[in-house]
């Protein structure tokens, strides 16, 4: 049975040309995780793996970087960057749990984090 | 320029154990993975596993762990598979290749083994 | 482990046509796909990755496309020299598996 839960940054602004980092937490689960996959709609952004370490995708490199933790850092925003944003956890014996992020990148500096919230 | 170079044809008999290397060139090793992958005659090809010679670290397909182990030596920038037991259905090419997690970039040769009494 | 499935392991085609090829992932691969050509006592060679990047110094006749489960691979004009298998893979988790390999060959 999946026990865990999956805790994000939740909803999120950022400003244009700015940068941004992407948080999940695993939690309530004995599971061991073999990768973590960052997806932004229908493109892999980077992924962790438990084994080999961190790979970022070749289209990605110049503004995707590691970390911290299992997290994610967009860099150079651009309005084009607005939109969900899911980590896959990967994890032995349960199965994958996946977390949701919704970015909106904004032109002003009125830019604010969101609260954080859980996605069982 | 890029180039894995591998160790040459083995005829070995069953039951004994081969190691395959391959050489790298013209990069840095310790930058991307090592990935193998076989192919039986008239076959398509099967990924084995992969290591990251920087980490040590490996990764294998559930079915040759126990047949397949995985090392890297970076002072020589070269990356070895040892394949144990050996039994008629390890006859296969084998290749090695530079990865990027994301694709296979540069290949090695091929190592033929034939595994015979 | 995530099966990748080319449902034709034989095309026949001609030069200059468009020939395409599918394959289809067991579950979610984003567009964590690669395809490679693998020509007869040759080692496989790159041409796309990420499901629609050619890779450096593959030729424009080539061209991938697809996300999720379903992927193709196109040749808009072949030619002679594409005589080869060619296979997807998946790089969305380990292990990195292959399809089956689809055999073009020309009439």
């Known amino acids: 049975m999946m026990t865990g839960t999956i805790e994000t940054t939740g909803n999120i602004s950022a400003e244009k040309g700015g940068s941004i980092i992407l948080q999940c937490h695993l939690s309530s689960t004995t599971a061991q995780v073999t990768q973590v996959n960052w997806e932004q709609q229908d493109q892999l952004l980077a992924i962790c793996n438990a084994d080999l370490g961190w790979h970022i995708s070749p289209s990605f490199k110049d503004r995707v970087a590691p970390g911290p933790g299992l997290g994610l850092t967009l860099q150079s925003l651009t309005v084009n960057d607005t939109g969900e944003y899911f980590c896959i956890y990967h994890t032995y014996p349960d199965g994958t749990y996946t977390g949701r992020i919704f970015l909106e990148v904004l032109e002003s500096s009125v830019a604010e984090h969101g609260a954080r919230f859980q996605i069982p | 320029q890029v180039q894995l170079q591998q160790s040459g044809a083995e005829l070995v008999r069953p039951g004994t154990s081969v190691k395959v290397s391959c050489k790298a060139s013209?990069?840095?090793?310790?930058?991307?993975?090592i990935e193998w992958v076989k192919q039986r005659p008239g076959q398509g090809l099967e990924w084995i596993g992969v290591i990251n010679p920087g980490s040590g670290g490996t990764n294998y397909k559930e079915k040759f762990k126990g047949k397949a182990t995985l090392t890297a030596d970076k002072s020589s920038s070269t990356a070895y598979m040892q394949l144990s037991s050996l039994t008629s259905e390890d006859s296969a090419v084998y290749f090695c290749?530079?990865?990027?997690?994301?694709?296979?970039?540069?290949w090695g040769q091929g190592t033929t083994l034939t595994v015979s009494s | 482990d995530i099966v990748m499935t080319q449902s034709h392991k034989f095309m026949s085609t001609s030069v200059g046509d468009r020939v395409s090829i599918t394959c289809k992932a067991s579950q979610h691969v984003s567009n964590g796909v690669a395809w490679y050509q693998h020509k007869p006592g040759q080692s496989p060679k790159l041409l796309i990755y990420s499901a629609s990047y050619r890779y450096t110094g593959v030729p424009d006749r080539f061209t991938g496309t697809g996300s999720g489960t379903d992927f193709t691979f196109t040749i808009s004009s072949v030619q002679a020299e594409d005589l080869a298998v060619y296979y997807c893979q998946q790089h969305y988790n380990t292990p990195h598996t292959f399809g089956g390999g689809t055999k073009l060959e020309i009439k």
């Open positions: 013209g990069y840095a090793f310790t930058n991307y993975l």
């Open positions: 290749a530079r990865g990027e997690y994301f694709f296979f970039d540069y």
